[in-house]
């Protein structure tokens, strides 16, 4: 019961986590214009992995997708890749874990197969969570670096002048969503891995060795005496004898003059 609960909870936590990773990846507020020096600005900018948005004090917002792949910073591309890998792994993990759930019966799937699938999905969730956390952390590090390194520069051309504005960007809501979602996916993955240990059947195959007792040829079968309470299948408390030294698999029970007790 505890294993099913752990597995089920792991699945739900991972599901929430992956939904959060998808939400964070799609959100526009990865970085927001720092308004510390200009709190009454009419217009401010916030940017995501895929597009840039401007919002004015009236609430009117306009977003435009980035034009090109080539003109974007390598770090941004890396963050995009990490988040997409996280989503893909998480989605595959969810698909695998649905079939691995103990509460769902699919044909004659053995517990060992379910255990392997649970472990596989757990590992996928862990990697997915780590990808999301890494992606968000790389982006956050980029923001912090740019925040302290930002400089204004100017260049002229064609009679006019273009000035690069010293705009500082700070952490957007998507970063916090990403961190929490990545953490949840990671926790869900760990729970699935823990559940896997409980699902795996304990295969302890004992080969019963025959012992030769003095006076009689006795092959002692472990479990020959089943509980005297009468709950076992061997309610007559039979002992099993055989003349030869055989393994448990070979032992046969013959009616004999030595049947007693």
């Amino acid at each position: 019961m505890a294993v099913t609960a752990c597995q089920g909870l792991g699945f739900v936590v991972s599901l929430i986590g992956i939904a959060g990773i998808i939400a964070a990846t799609c959100m526009d507020q990865w970085s927001t214009q720092d308004l510390y020096n200009n709190p009454v600005t009419a217009v401010f900018n916030y940017q995501g992995l895929w597009r840039s948005c401007v919002r004015e004090s009236s609430g009117f917002t306009e977003c435009r997708g980035y034009f090109t792949l080539l003109g974007l910073p390598a770090m941004l591309q890396a963050v995009r890749a990490l988040m997409i890998v996280g989503i893909v792994l998480g989605a595959i993990g969810l698909l695998v874990s649905i079939f691995a759930l103990k509460c769902i019966r699919i044909g004659s799937m053995e517990d060992s197969a379910k255990a392997n699938m649970t472990l596989t999905s757990g590992i996928m969730f862990i990697v997915s969570g780590l990808c999301a956390i890494a992606g968000v952390s790389v982006f956050a590090n980029m923001l912090v670096t740019n925040f302290w390194m930002s400089t204004a520069n100017m260049y002229t051309g064609m009679g006019g002048m273009v000035q690069t504005v010293q705009t500082r960007y700070t952490f957007g809501a998507a970063l916090f969503v990403g961190w929490v979602a990545g953490g949840l996916t990671l926790i869900g993955g760990v729970m699935m891995c823990i559940a896997c240990r409980g699902l795996a059947p304990e295969e302890t195959n004992y080969k019963a060795v025959s012992y030769h007792a003095s006076g009689h040829s006795v092959a002692y079968k472990p479990g020959g005496f089943k509980a005297s309470t009468g709950f076992g299948s061997n309610t007559k408390n039979k002992k099993i004898y055989d003349g030869g030294a055989r393994t448990e698999d070979e032992v046969q029970s013959y009616p004999s003059k030595h049947d007693y007790v």
């Epitope: 009419a42 004015e56 306009e62 000035q163 504005v165």
Partner: nanobody
Framework: QVQLVESGGGLVQPGGSLRLSCAAS????????TGWYRQAPGKQRDLVAT???????NYADSVKGRFTISRDKSKNTAYLQMDNLKPEDTAVYFC??????????????WDAGTQVTVSS
């Protein structure tokens, strides 16, 4: 690279009208605000009017009721309609655009300016 092309300046009599236009071109992602500053001889540059991407306008007190700023979003162009011009409106008018050109790349572009002279 962002470029601004301004047109419409010239000589006009007091009480007359002029229309300035300012077209922004280049790899512009978001055009945040567009507007005009002016600089009279021997004076500092003053704000005339601004318009945000959403259409919110702002005017200097000296031009309120006489000047109207508008924009054509599809052409990334702003217009300054100047009516009932006075001799004190004589100045070099500079168009500017505050733009986002890429990821965490915000720039303010200025044009070279156009002369507006109000004289009889």
């Amino acid at each position: 690279q962002v470029q601004l092309v301004e047109s419409g300046g010239g000589l006009v009599q007091p009480g007359g009208s002029l229309r300035l236009s300012c077209a922004a071109s280049g790899s512009i992602l978001n055009l945040m605000t567009t507007g005009w500053y002016r600089q009279a001889p021997g004076k500092q540059r003053d704000l005339v009017a601004t318009i945000t991407f959403g259409g919110t306008t702002n005017y200097a007190d000296s031009v309120k009721g006489r000047f109207t700023i508008s924009r054509d979003k599809s052409k990334n162009t702003a217009y300054l309609q100047m009516d009932n011009l006075k001799p004190e409106d004589t100045a070099v008018y500079f168009c500017y655009a505050d733009v986002i050109v890429g990821f965490q790349d915000r720039r303010v572009a200025w044009d070279a300016g156009t002369q507006v002279t109000v004289s009889s």
